[in-house]
Each structure stands twice: as structure tokens, then as C-alpha cells.
């Protein structure tokens, strides 16, 4: 998970759409992707920022504990 | 209507510090960057870093080699610039300035005039 | 970091003539087709007013005698036609990557 946030972050040269992207990858079971995207004000960069790095992160999550779940079997 | 308003000019010794503020009004502040430039005499703009006061974070111009410092006040919508060690090079009008869009500087403050000299 | 190089230094036009202002990149200021290169206008006393943003984008109330163009490293700034009031220098500025860099700037004079 680490090694392709990295991967994505690094694209991002402004500091701020950097963090964006490090946000997005936070844990949050309450909330989507979309519904945390939509309390960012400071700027589509960001906003696009956290979504990809959000939705990346919450995809390998799911891909992990779905392998995780085939190993206890 | 958005507005940036700085301190007054400044005098200052070789050496010492020195803080200059920028209110802002007319927006909701923690949703904009605020950046400070600088321009000497006769010179052009130069970038010295900025804050976003929503999150607290930072980024430097590496020229300053850690002499300058960016902080907001949220409860009254300031951002502060401390620039240290102050020396004549250091002579020059800084300015705030808010980034639209983490895009463009959209308002400006009306500059402050810094002069170091002993 | 990303250098911009302004050309000319300076400028001097006859009102009602055009002036052309470039801003060479180091690198390209591109991502995803969006090209993030403004320009401000500074006269004596003033802070810098924004002029054009994302390249061709004009701010509110500034005239539709300036007009911005360009892509990836090599950018333009024009003024057609040139009236008094342009008499200022004119900066262009990347937003692309920290840190923000501005070109040298420009000087207009008018004749």
C-alpha cells in the first residue's frame, strides 16, 4: 500500500496536493471516498488528489484482506 | 469583499528578527493558502514559502536556509511571516498573497517595506 | 526548480500598437493538459494585480486587450493594443510545483 501511495504522491509537486493525497489515504469506515472528497475547499487539485489516493488505498485494503480471508480458510 | 492587510513598515538592526502580519477578511480563511513573496529594490518577486491554515502545513523557499518561519491564527485570520537573522540583502517589500484553486494568487496584501540597516 | 527566463527585458510601444511579452520554462508547467502559467501586472507602489491565469484565462475586470497562450515551456503574453495605462512590469509565474517561481520580468514603456 505504502510503495503505490508513494508512487502516486510522487506526481504530485506541490506540497499541499501532495498531503491531499496522503489524507486520502487515512482510514475512514464511516465515510466514502466521494462523501470526504466533498468537504474539500481548498481546490480541485486537491480534491483530485485525495480521491485517487483514497480510492487506490481503499481498493489494495479490500484486494488484502480478501487474500487474508483465502489464507484462514 | 476579500481583503489582505498588513503591518506597518519596519526598521531593523543587522541580525535581529522580524514579523510582519497579514489579516484576512471577507473570505472563510482556513479555505485558501496564504504564500509571502518578497521583492528588493528594483528588483522582482521572489517566493518565500506559504501556510494553509486549515491543516497548518508548511513549505519554505530553501534560499532562506531556515531563517523564515509561516504561522496562522485561525481565531483571527492571520498569517504571520518571521524572517530572522536579518540582514541588508534582506531589505525589500513583502508581501501576502492568497492562492485560488491551488492555482494563482488572486488578492494581494498592499506590501510592507522592511529595511535592515545598522 | 522550474526557471522562467522573460523576454524582453523591456519593452518600449507606441499606444495602439501590440507588445509581446515570452515566458520560457525550464520544464514543461503541464499536467494533465492543464497548464499552470499566470501573469500579473506590477505598477510603481502596487502590489502585483493577477492578469491571466492557466495560461489564457483572463481575471475579472482586466481588458480584453490582454490575451495569454501558449503550452508545455514557451508562453505569451500580449497587449493589443498597447494603451498608456499599461505602463507597468509585467511577471509571469508557475503554480505547477513548489517551489512557485516567477519569471524576471518585464518592462513596458509606453512611447
Known amino acids: 500500500l505504502q510503495e503505490k501511495i508513494e508512487e502516486i504522491a510522487a506526481k504530485y509537486k506541490h506540497l499541499v496536493v501532495k498531503k491531499c493525497c496522503y489524507d486520502g489515504v487515512r482510514i475512514n469506515h464511516d465515510e466514502t471516498c466521494e462523501q470526504r472528497a466533498a468537504r474539500i475547499s481548498v481546490g480541485p487539485r486537491c480534491v483530485k488528489a485525495f480521491t485517487e489516493c483514497c480510492v487506490v488505498a481503499s481498493q489494495l485494503r479490500a484486494n488484502n484482506s480478501h487474500k487474508d480471508l483465502q489464507l484462514g480458510r | 469583499q476579500v481583503q489582505l492587510v498588513q503591518s506597518g513598515a519596519e526598521v531593523k538592526k543587522p541580525g535581529s528578527s522580524v514579523k510582519v502580519s497579514c489579516k484576512a477578511s471577507?473570505?472563510?480563511?482556513?479555505?485558501?493558502?496564504i504564500h509571502w513573496m518578497r521583492q528588493a529594490p528594483g528588483q522582482g518577486l521572489e517566493w518565500m514559502g506559504y501556510?494553509?491554515?486549515?491543516?497548518?502545513?508548511?513549505n519554505y523557499n530553501e534560499n532562506f536556509k531556515g531563517r523564515v518561519t509561516i504561522t496562522a491564527d485561525k481565531s483571527t485570520s492571520t498569517a504571520y511571516m518571521e524572517l530572522s537573522s536579518l540582514r541588508s540583502e534582506d531589505t525589500a517589500v513583502y508581501y501576502c498573497?492568497?492562492?485560488?484553486?491551488?492555482?494563482?494568487?488572486?488578492?494581494w496584501g498592499q506590501g510592507t517595506t522592511v529595511t535592515v540597516s545598522s | 526548480d522550474i526557471v522562467l527566463t522573460q523576454s524582453p527585458a523591456s519593452l518600449a510601444v507606441s499606444p495602439g500598437q501590440r507588445a509581446t511579452i515570452t515566458c520560457k520554462a525550464s520544464?514543461?508547467?503541464?499536467?494533465?493538459?492543464?497548464?499552470?502559467m499566470n501573469w500579473y501586472q506590477q505598477k510603481p507602489g502596487q502590489p502585483p494585480k493577477l492578469l491571466i491565469y492557466?495560461?489564457?484565462n483572463l481575471d475579472s475586470g482586466v481588458p480584453a486587450r490582454f490575451s495569454g497562450s501558449g503550452s508545455g515551456t514557451d508562453f505569451t503574453l500580449t497587449i493589443n493594443p498597447v494603451e498608456a495605462e499599461d505602463t507597468a512590469n509585467y511577471y509571469c509565474?508557475?503554480?505547477?510545483?513548489?517551489?512557485?517561481?516567477f519569471g524576471g520580468g518585464t518592462k513596458v514603456e509606453i512611447k
Open positions: 498573497a492568497r492562492e485560488r484553486n491551488l492555482e494563482y494568487f488572486d488578492y
Open positions: 471577507g473570505y472563510t480563511f482556513t479555505d485558501h493558502i
Open positions: 501556510i494553509y491554515p486549515r491543516e497548518g502545513w508548511t
Open positions: 520544464q514543461s508547467v503541464d499536467y494533465e493538459g492543464f497548464n499552470y
Open positions: 492557466a495560461t489564457s
Open positions: 509565474q508557475q503554480s505547477l510545483e513548489d517551489p512557485h517561481t
